[in-house]
């Protein structure tokens, strides 16, 4: 027999199947051109000294063989003597170590058995009514296919599934979607309605994330506010990585979980933009404002649960940096300017009240004045900080106010609003004898003392009503008592107390008259 022909004689080895576990398997045969055919198979076991024979039986009952030698692939033409338009039965016999091993048979019509490809190129994955939908372009000239899929998770073996018959230029498959674990999918195809046609190879892995992206388990820390009025947000703990099935480890497009950082600046609500979303890897600098920070995890199916933190405002105050002058036309604040063309946000809120009650004002971009100061003025009619109470003031600055992460804190301080000099007047001044020539003067704390850093000192004035001599005694802002000594018995005195701020002299309290009684000796 010629090697190119199927030999219609008995093969050159005894006809006996050893029934061993090794041997030929997975025989596939198909047409590869208008007149050429190919069969290929796998051989399990030691390959040394193995000879393979492709056997073929025609519908007439006549059988022939091709000698393939040690190869596990064989090509032949339509001139080889094999009927290609009618059904034939093919199998492989492998002769090794004086025994014959047989593959399972395949029965097919060779002419219409086309080598089907698995889905090639881009397999689009989407979610449809709680299931996974895969879609791909049908390989060229291969419309009409049966499609199967197999899938596994990191902890489960392959499971087989059926996509059903396909008959279009695009093919698709509905597959199960796992809620919380990643899956690896592979697809294969075979010719539709062709008896005994072989399955294609499995496609490349399609890696699919869980329906719910994992909740980010991260922790943040915030550094101290620096000289530039900014503090760094740092990630203390990276998000945990998703466990992947074997074929998705390494490069696994499709299973990526992206973590985004959403910043919401709570302070200074009058600015243009309050929120900004960043990649988690790019940790921002923040001003000393209060922020809410959310980490949002998302995959190709959309966002998952987020984790939210509150970053409180930095309450470190600069008691001297802010100058406030109160005039008849209104009030003006002065502070050291940051740079040219800066926008400032001045925020104030009554102390001890909810942060939601903060009020703010945004300045137009301004350059420093000749003294290097920035200013903000308001009239009495505006009502800003008009009530006689303590306000917490924070000033933020930015050269790019539309960019949330470029704000910095200029200063934080306290200010007593309204008519501070009158409102701060100490009340309940009382005088008690202390000794033969001294008295103790007490008073209730000034309202200014509720405003940290605002009350510079108390001044106690004592006036001798006889000689009209006046003495003034400065008292620490934390004290509400002073001892006046060197007084004369029987002389009438008046005492008054006032509370001063750094920029404002207080109003004296109502005069309090007293005298030290003359002691009569027995």
């Amino acid at each position: 027999c010629r090697t190119s022909e199927c030999c219609f004689q008995d093969p050159p080895y005894p006809d006996a199947d050893s029934g061993s576990a090794s041997g030929p398997r997975d025989l596939r045969c198909y047409r590869i051109s208008s007149d050429r055919y190919e069969c290929s198979w796998q051989y399990e076991g030691p390959t040394a000294g193995v000879s393979h024979f492709l056997r073929c039986c025609l519908s007439s009952g006549r059988c022939c063989y091709f000698a393939a030698g040690s190869a596990t692939r064989l090509q032949f033409s339509d001139q080889a003597g094999v009927s290609v338009l009618y059904t034939v039965t093919l199998w492989v016999e492998s002769w090794a170590r004086n025994q014959t091993e047989k593959s399972p048979e395949v029965t097919l019509q060779l002419y219409n058995s086309v080598k089907y490809e698995p889905p090639l190129g881009d397999i689009k994955v989407s979610k449809l009514a709680g299931q996974l939908r895969m879609e791909w372009e049908t390989p060229d000239n291969q419309v009409g296919a049966e499609v199967q899929f197999r899938h596994r998770t990191p902890s489960s073996p392959w499971k087989l599934g059926d996509c059903g018959p396909q008959d279009d230029d695009t093919e698709s498959c509905l597959c199960p979607l796992e809620m919380n674990v990643a899956q690896e999918f592979q697809l294969r195809r075979r010719q539709l309605g062709s008896q005994g046609s072989s399955w294609s190879k499995w496609s490349s892995p399609v890696c699919v994330p869980p329906e719910n992206p994992p909740q980010p388990q991260v922790r943040f820390s915030v550094e101290q506010l620096g000289q530039d009025g900014r503090r760094r947000l740092t990630l203390k703990e990276q998000p945990t990585q998703l466990e992947l099935p074997e074929g998705c480890q390494g490069l696994a497009p499709g299973t990526e979980v992206t973590y985004r950082l959403q910043l919401h600046m709570l302070s200074c609500p009058c600015k243009a933009k309050a929120t900004r979303t960043l990649h988690l890897g790019k940790m921002p600098y923040l001003s000393g404002a209060a922020y809410n920070v959310a980490v949002i995890s998302s995959n190709q199916f959309g966002p998952g649960l987020n984790q939210t933190w509150h970053i409180p405002a930095d309450t470190h105050t600069e008691p001297v940096a802010l100058n406030i002058s109160v005039g008849t036309n209104g009030t003006t604040m002065y502070w050291p300017a940051r740079a040219q063309s800066m926008t400032y946000c001045i925020e104030w809120q009554p102390v001890g009240q909810d942060g939601g009650l903060a009020t703010c004002s945004l300045t137009a971009p301004q350059d420093p004045d000749p003294a290097g100061m920035a200013t903000y003025s308001w009239s009495r009619e505006s009502g800003a900080m008009g009530q006689e109470k303590c306000y917490y003031i924070t000033i933020f600055a930015s050269a790019h106010p539309e960019k949330l992460t470029l704000w910095s804190t200029v200063l934080s301080t306290y200010h007593f609003g309204g008519n501070a000099s009158a409102a701060g007047t100490p009340h309940h001044v009382s005088v008690k004898n202390h000794s033969l020539d001294s008295v103790s003067v007490d008073w209730a704390p000034s309202l200014l003392s509720t405003c940290p850093g605002v009350l510079k000192e108390y001044v106690v004035r004592c006036r001798d009503e006889d000689s009209k001599q006046v003495s003034e005694h400065p008292v620490q802002p934390t004290e509400t008592q002073v001892t006046l000594s060197g007084l004369r018995a029987g002389v009438a005195y008046t005492v008054q107390v006032r509370a001063d701020t750094a920029w404002l002299r207080g109003v004296w309290s109502q005069p309090q008259r007293f005298s030290i009684e003359v002691q009569v000796s027995d």
Epitope: D78, Q79, V82, L85
Partner: nanobody
């Protein structure tokens, strides 16, 4: 004597249709597999379509699948090839062939009986 005669060839426009007939005489062809082949100038004879004796099974070359249809009328001892959506590359001499051995091949030398052929020309 045994004879196969093709007819129905001619000139057609691209996109047009032709119907070829193959009449058999001299023996009963109703027991034979029948096929159409074609040969363009300077090329080898190529398989076009095949029909088994009962008309239960048909096969087509990839280049004509969906455009050509083979059929037979055993009472009239005739085989047909309906050609639609013709293309310039379909231009060739078309031959009718018979395989009494039912071998089921696309190789022209396996066929025992042949007609003289009919010319089909498709102009663009």
């Amino acid at each position: 004597q045994v004879q196969l005669v093709e007819s129905g060839g001619g000139l057609a426009q691209a996109g047009g249709s032709l119907r070829l007939s193959c009449a058999a005489s001299g023996r009963t062809f109703s027991n034979d597999d029948m096929a159409w082949f074609r040969q363009a100038p300077g090329k080898e004879r190529e398989f076009v379509a095949h029909i088994d004796r009962n008309a239960a099974s048909t096969n087509y070359a990839d280049s004509v699948k969906g455009r050509f249809t083979i059929s037979r009328d055993n009472a009239k001892n005739t085989v047909y090839l309906q050609m639609t959506r013709l293309k310039p590359e379909d231009t060739a001499v078309y031959y009718c062939a018979a395989d009494p051995d039912h071998f089921g091949t696309t190789w022209y030398q396996q066929y025992t009986y042949w007609g003289p052929g009919t010319q089909v020309t498709v102009s663009s």
